[in-house]
Structure formats: structure tokens, C-alpha cells
């Protein structure tokens, strides 16, 4: 026997008060799949979290961050703040990058520049807190005197993080 | 439902006081990282201080260090923003938010944000 609820398309509920009749879902739910037996509360975008897509009978509504915030999580679940290029985000708020440590977005954590010399390559520019070092050509491909190579910056040590 | 709802707020004079309050409620706050963000008439919203879940670590924003204290208590569910010698520039709408699910080990996000407190610094 086939289910009556079955019947019912997305942007309704099977209404078990009334008989099984396909009720439209109320204000603020919705029911994004047919045969449902209740609809589900739409989403609020409150706070720090702004609406990016209103809800509607059939989907739910879509949340982003106010500026200065990004999105974090499946479906934007929650904002994080935004920091300088140059800096990251602790718990004792947005950081300066340690030496050696560089971050060109505003968001994410700070990397270790670049050991050029891992690849045999010399400094072409040095780092800094927001942009990487640039590696030029290796030593033994440079002119003598043509170049001063810049020793390559040490990785962040443990204990120097910001945190 | 999950709620954080803030008061406390009001018009008082420079050099005055303030505290706010956060009550939450449908989710277990003892687990959260709570934290208090506010946002000046036009500018962006800007972190205040924060707490971890059992009020050991306290983290501020520099221009409020010394003046402002963050507190929560647990067996009420409530947090707390007590302000002292007020400026004006510390006029803005407060707003207490929850640290999401792995706040400070694998982010810093927030999942959970009041309606907000204006609080107004005025003579």
C-alpha cells in the first residue's frame, strides 16, 4: 500500500492531524525533500552572521559574515574574525607574525618563510611578516661579487608563537 | 533553543561604570569559550575580551586592559563585562557570542551571537 505521504512535494508536510493532506509548511520552515511528515525551522542569520539567501518554503536560508569576519564550517556554522595581512588570529587576538613567519591573507596562521638554501638557491628578496622571501638563483650560478646572498631566515621555534 | 541574550547596557559619564550581562541558555556553557565583541556607531565589529570555559584564561583588547573585566559564572549561566573608568570612544553595542566546537585548538570562530547592549559614554 502505497504511503499517502508520499504525495506530498517539497515546500509541504504530511499534516498526521488532518487526515494525511499535504499541508503547506508555515512561516519560517520549510521542507526541502517531498514525503516529509513535519518541516524544519528556517535558519537565522543573527548577529556577526548575515543573510546571504532568505528562506524559503522549499530551502533553508543561507548565512555569511558581516565584514571583517569570514566564514568558517559546513554551510558557514560559524564567523571568525579577520586579521592584517602580516598578522594571525590567537586566542589573545590578532597577532604580529613572528620573525621569520610571514601571512599574506587575513586569514589562516603564520608560515615559516622559505629556506632557500634547502634548494640550493640564494635570497633574491627578503621576507617579511607579509610577504614570503623570494629565492634567486642558486650561489654557484652567480658572477662573483654579483649578488650579496642573504642567509636564510630560521623557521619559527617552538615558544615564539603569539599564543 | 540556543539563546544569549545581553543587558546591562545604558547612558552613563566618562570615568563612570557599566556592567553587562549575558545569560545563555539551551546549550551546556560551561563547555564554551565565551567572548565580548562590540561595534562603534559605523565601524566594523571589534573583539573586547574573552574567557575559557572555566574563567582561568582572560584575554583583552589593548584599549580596554586595566579598565575592563570579563567574568563568567557557570552554575548561572552568565557572563559578565564589568566596565570601569568609561570613555567615549567605548560607545557601541556589545554583543556577547559562544566559541564554536574547538575554539582555540582549531579556531577562533562563533557560532552563537546575542541581540546586543548599547552602551552610550556621554557627558
Known amino acids: 500500500l502505497q504511503d499517502p505521504c508520499s504525495n506530498c512535494p517539497a515546500g509541504t508536510f504530511c499534516d498526521n492531524n488532518r487526515n494525511q493532506i499535504c499541508s503547506p509548511c508555515p512561516p519560517n520552515s520549510f521542507s526541502s525533500a517531498g514525503g516529509q511528515r513535519t518541516c524544519d525551522i528556517c535558519r537565522q542569520c543573527k548577529g556577526v552572521f548575515r543573510t546571504r539567501k532568505e528562506c524559503s518554503s522549499t530551502s533553508n536560508a543561507e548565512c555569511d559574515c558581516t565584514p571583517g569576519f569570514h566564514c568558517l564550517g559546513a554551510g558557514c556554522s560559524m564567523c571568525e574574525q579577520d586579521c592584517k595581512q602580516g598578522q594571525e588570529l590567537t586566542k589573545k587576538g590578532c597577532k604580529d607574525c613572528c620573525f621569520g613567519t610571514f601571512n599574506d591573507q587575513k586569514r589562516g596562521i603564520c608560515r615559516p618563510w622559505t629556506n632557500c638554501s634547502l634548494d640550493g638557491k640564494s635570497v633574491l628578496v627578503n621576507g617579511t611578516k607579509e610577504r614570503d622571501v623570494v629565492c634567486g638563483p642558486s650561489p654557484a650560478d652567480l658572477s662573483p661579487g654579483a649578488s650579496s646572498v642573504t642567509p636564510p631566515a630560521p623557521a619559527r621555534e617552538p615558544g615564539h608563537s603569539p599564543q | 533553543e540556543v539563546q544569549l541574550v545581553e543587558s546591562g547596557g545604558g547612558l552613563v559619564k566618562p570615568g563612570g561604570s557599566l556592567r553587562l550581562s549575558c545569560a545563555a541558555s539551551?546549550?551546556?556553557?560551561?563547555?564554551?569559550?565565551m567572548i565580548w565583541y562590540r561595534q562603534a556607531p559605523g565601524e566594523e565589529l571589534e573583539w573586547v575580551a574573552n574567557?575559557?570555559?572555566?574563567?582561568?584564561?582572560?584575554y583583552y583588547v589593548d584599549s580596554v586592559k586595566g579598565r575592563f573585566t570579563i567574568s563568567r559564572d557557570n552554575a548561572t549561566n552568565s557572563l559578565f563585562l564589568q566596565m570601569n573608568s568609561l570613555r567615549a570612544e567605548d560607545t557601541a553595542v556589545y554583543y556577547c557570542?559562544?566559541?564554536?566546537?574547538?575554539?582555540?585548538?582549531?579556531?577562533?570562530?562563533?557560532?552563537?551571537w546575542g541581540q546586543g547592549t548599547t552602551v552610550t559614554v556621554s557627558s
Open positions: 574567557i575559557n570555559q572555566d574563567g582561568s584564561e582572560k
Open positions: 557570542a559562544r566559541g564554536g566546537d574547538g575554539y582555540s585548538n582549531s579556531h577562533y570562530g562563533m557560532d552563537v
Open positions: 539551551g546549550f551546556t556553557f560551561s563547555n564554551y569559550w
